[in-house]
Structure formats: structure tokens, C-alpha cells
């Protein structure tokens, strides 16, 4: 009697299964007492013997390439074995490679987490992912898994971290890289610093006073605020950031406390108070201001 | 298929500004740098900068900064680049390209667009 | 910025011979990543570079075998085995490894 291996599907993909039955045409298997065998290469496989002739392999994967063969055994304790049968398991490459962002949309706040996602559309086997930062790339890590994606992490996110990013997914085919995603890190802003400027050492009535404000950092565009006494003065924007300034022509009532707030939309701050009095010089004739 | 295509030829004064257009096309356009390359009669090519179409981002080589500025519109997959305050010495043909990134090199060029300046 | 300077500045050849052309480097082009920049484009007459051979040594697909890069540091080459009609025009080197990035003065292969 003669004995076949037969493989289902006869050239699988990576990761998919397959099914091996042991066959004997001109014999049935219920006409006598078998025990089967699968074999790769020289390593029996699955159970061992067993009243089955069918061997079910869940997955395969490329180096379960190989040869393979059954054997059949009666109850005589005579043995039957099938020729080799060579399965070629194939391999697919990474196709599609995608790079996106935890947060989506590549805003991260100063300090928060931030996860880059590589993802591949398809490929099998051992994928190698490698994370690249900015597009002259310097390699930040690499993970090699069995999976169709993979995550680097940067738990708390610097000012440094803003860049361009992109991943590279490998499974023996060649490289494939993403697209650049750009990474905007956002900062509130700092307690701004107010700055009183008067044209002379002692600034007098109908003077023109500048007032400064400046956070020394923060995301633009920012807001600022202008205050005396707690009163609105009045707004100016720093759309690429830096300071602004506000010009106030100066009446008597000028005196007395100044301060500035700036706000970029992630938090509001407000500077120190800086105090203007009117002073009035020996022998002067009109009043004068100092801060 | 990939493709960059260059707005036409422009003859302007001197002291005026020009726009150059870029139009991608067959990929992704926010997924690469775009780059501008300037070529002088006769003469060499200068590398003046890049963009980046996902947000705009940029880098210039010092020379250009002031006298160019790159944009570009997700919208309509084009690069922009500007010059201003033209000079003849701004006369030249200017491409813009893809560098692609991992491989690193300019993978597919603009036809170029000739700039002449004329009083 | 990094100079880039190319040798010869015209190549008179004939169809079929071997020549090399030079390009030299002012400082190491070696970027802070360990790669080395450093790229051959060819620019026939009205037409826009096309790139022949990128990271020193590596042919872009559709690139005959008969062009090959090979150096490092400072000293790069370009070599063409055996010349070919449409292998004439300008040849340029390229650093990608500083900023600003950088371009040969460009070699014209021409016929002799």
C-alpha cells in the first residue's frame, strides 16, 4: 500500500494554517488499525502517533519550511512511509507603512505622553519597526514583533521633541518607511515679566508710557492683557510670540499699580505688580512720574 | 505616478515679487519635504530650502532667508515659493524636488521655472 | 557652509572609456547620525537633475550598473565604466549632511 502526504493549502501564507492528511488510496483506514505520524525535515510533529490522519498546524510561519512526510503503522507494527513533501511558506512583505500619534493630530502638551503608532497594512512574519526623528533621521529604537503594529513612546514630551517623525517597518523585503508627521509640542506660558518705559528718567504728564509685557515662554499666538488697578487698559497679540507692548498717554491719574496677563489658550498668567507714583522735584512746575 | 508641475515661465522687474507654484501629484502630499533648488544661467545649483505641506513648517539656507518665503496648500497639493525685492541676480531657473526620507535623496524634480528679470 | 568641489571641470570622453570624477568635501560629511550624505545627480541640457547614486555607494533603481560611488569623509568618486551617448551632460555632487546643503560646481562629460 502506498501512502501520500497531502498539505492544505499546498503553499500557505505566513500565519495562516494548514492541514496535513496522511492518505492511502487503496486502502481504508477503517479495513485495519492505523497509527499516524507527521514528520518535518528529522522532528516528528504535533502528538506523535495518533489515530488521526490529519495533523492541523494553527499557523505557519517561514522557517516551518521544509520537507515534510507522514508515516502509518498497523497494528502488525509495520510501517508505511509517504516521500517528502516540501511546503514553501510564504512570506508577505510590508506594504503601506503608517505612522500616527497619540494624541492624534501630533499636538502634545509639555510634560504629557506622547505614542508613536507604526502600522503596516500588510506583511507576516517578524516585522522589524524602527522609529526615526527628523527627516535627516536619527534612530530612536527598534522593536521587532509579530504584529501589524507597533508603539515608542515618550512619556514626557520636551520642547526639544517638537520635530518631524517617521517610522520604517522590515520583514526581509527591504525597508518601507511612512510618511513625516510633524510634532508640535504646546507650552503654556510662563508668568510674564512687565516692563514700564517712559521716554526720560522722569516721565511727566502727556508723556507717552510703554508698557511691556513679555512671557519668556509659551506657545504663540499669545494674548496680553493690560491692567491699572485691575482695571482693562486694553489688549495686544503676539502672533509668533515674543512680547507686546501697550502705549498710554499720561494724565495724573496714571498712578498707581500696573500689571500684564498673558494667556496662549493652554493658561493664563499675570505678571507682578509694578508700582508708578507721581513725585513732585523741588522747584519743578509740573508733576513727574517714577516707577 | 508621481509627479511635480512647475508654474511657467515669468518675466518681471526688478524690485517686484514673484510666485512660483509646485503642484504634487501620485502621492501623499503632506508625507515628504519639498525642496527648492536655484540654477543661475550656465552655472550650478543652490539649495535654498524646504517645506514641509503636513504644517508648514521650514528650513532655509541663510543666503535666501528674506528673500524667500515657501507656503503651501494641503487643499490643492501645491508648494509655493516667493521671491521678493527681485534683483538680477535673482534671474535663474528655479526647480523644486522630493527628498524622501530613510533613503534619503530627491526622488522626482519639478520641470524648473525660468525667472527672468527685465527693465 | 561645506564646499563642495568637484574635478575635472569638463571631461572630454569617447563612447565606451572608463573615467572617474572627483568631488572633495571642505569638512567630514559624516552626519552626527553616522550616515554620510553625500549624493551624484546628472542634468542633461534643459532638463532637471536626475539622481544616479545616493548615500555614497547606492545606485537608484533604474541606475545602469556602469555608474558606481565609492568614498568616504572628505574624498568621493564617481566612476562610469563605460560611457554611453546618453551619459553625456553635468554631473553633480551633493551634501545632504549639513545645512545648508550643498552642490558641486558640477563636471560636464562631453564628447571629445
Known amino acids: 500500500a502506498e501512502l501520500f502526504l497531502i498539505a492544505s493549502p499546498s503553499h500557505p501564507t505566513e500565519g495562516s494554517p494548514v492541514t496535513l492528511t496522511c492518505k492511502m488510496p487503496f486502502l481504508q483506514s477503517s479495513d485495519a488499525q492505523f497509527q499516524f505520524c507527521f514528520f518535518r525535515d528529522t522532528r516528528a510533529l504535533g502528538p506523535g502517533w495518533s489515530s488521526s490522519p490529519k495533523l492541523q498546524i494553527a499557523a505557519m510561519w517561514k522557517e516551518d519550511t521544509g520537507s515534510y512526510w507522514c508515516e502509518a503503522q498497523t497494528m502488525a507494527s509495520k510501517v508505511l512511509r509517504s516521500r517528502r513533501s516540501q511546503i514553501n511558506v510564504h512570506r508577505v512583505p510590508v506594504a503601506d507603512v503608517s505612522l500616527e500619534t497619540q494624541p492624534p493630530g501630533g499636538q502634545v502638551m509639555e510634560g504629557d505622553r506622547l505614542v508613536l503608532i507604526c502600522s503596516v497594512a500588510m506583511g507576516t512574519g517578524d516585522i522589524t519597526f524602527l522609529w526615526y526623528k527628523g527627516a535627516v533621521g536619527l534612530n530612536l529604537q527598534s522593536k521587532t514583533q509579530r504584529s501589524l503594529t507597533a508603539e515608542y513612546e515618550i512619556p514626557s514630551v520636551r520642547e526639544s521633541d517638537a520635530e518631524q517623525y517617521y517610522c520604517v517597518a522590515e520583514n526581509g523585503y527591504g525597508p518601507s518607511p511612512s510618511g513625516l508627521v510633524s510634532i508640535t509640542v504646546r507650552i503654556p506660558v510662563s508668568r510674564p515679566i512687565l516692563m514700564l518705559r517712559a521716554p526720560r528718567a522722569q516721565a511727566a504728564v502727556e508723556d507717552v508710557l510703554e508698557l511691556h509685557c513679555e512671557a519668556l515662554r509659551g506657545s504663540p499666538p499669545i494674548l496680553y492683557w493690560f491692567y491699572h488697578e485691575d482695571i482693562t487698559l486694553g489688549s495686544r497679540s503676539a502672533p509668533s510670540g515674543g512680547g507686546a507692548s501697550f502705549n498710554l498717554s499720561l494724565t495724573e491719574e496714571h498712578s498707581g499699580n500696573y500689571s500684564c496677563e498673558a494667556n496662549n489658550g493652554l493658561g493664563a498668567q499675570r505678571s507682578e505688580a509694578v508700582t508708578l507714583n507721581f513725585t513732585v522735584p523741588t522747584g519743578a512746575r509740573s508733576n513727574h512720574l517714577t516707577s | 505616478q508621481v509627479q511635480l508641475q512647475q508654474s511657467g515661465p515669468e518675466l518681471v522687474k526688478p524690485g517686484a515679487s514673484v510666485r512660483i507654484s509646485c503642484k504634487a501629484s501620485g502621492y501623499t502630499f503632506t508625507s515628504y519635504n519639498i525642496h527648492w533648488v536655484k540654477q543661475r544661467p550656465g552655472q550650478g545649483l543652490e539649495w535654498i530650502g524646504w517645506i514641509y505641506p503636513g504644517d508648514g513648517n521650514t528650513k532655509y539656507n541663510e543666503k535666501f532667508k528674506g528673500k524667500t518665503t515657501l507656503t503651501a496648500d494641503k487643499s490643492s497639493s501645491t508648494a509655493y515659493m516667493q521671491l521678493s525685492s527681485l534683483t538680477s541676480e535673482d534671474s535663474a531657473v528655479y526647480f523644486c524636488?522630493?527628498?524622501?526620507?530613510?533613503?534619503?535623496?530627491?526622488?522626482?524634480w519639478g520641470q524648473g521655472t525660468t525667472l527672468t528679470l527685465s527693465s | 557652509d561645506v564646499l563642495m568641489t568637484q574635478t575635472p571641470l569638463s571631461l572630454p570622453v569617447s563612447l565606451g572609456d572608463q573615467v572617474s570624477i572627483s568631488c572633495r568635501s571642505g569638512q567630514t560629511i559624516v552626519h552626527s547620525n553616522g550616515n554620510t550624505y553625500l549624493e551624484w545627480y546628472l542634468q542633461k541640457p534643459g532638463q532637471s537633475p536626475k539622481l544616479l547614486i545616493y548615500?555614497?555607494?547606492n545606485r537608484f533603481s533604474g541606475v545602469p550598473d556602469r555608474f558606481s560611488g565609492s568614498g568616504s569623509g572628505t574624498d568621493f568618486t564617481l566612476r562610469i565604466s563605460r560611457v554611453e551617448a546618453e551619459d553625456l551632460g553635468v554631473y553633480y555632487c551633493?551634501?545632504?549632511?549639513?545645512?545648508?546643503?550643498?552642490f558641486g560646481g558640477g563636471t560636464k562629460l562631453e564628447i571629445k
Open positions: 551633493f551634501q545632504g549632511s549639513h545645512v545648508p546643503w550643498t
Open positions: 548615500k555614497v555607494s
Open positions: 524636488a522630493r527628498r524622501i526620507h530613510y533613503f534619503d535623496y530627491f526622488d522626482y
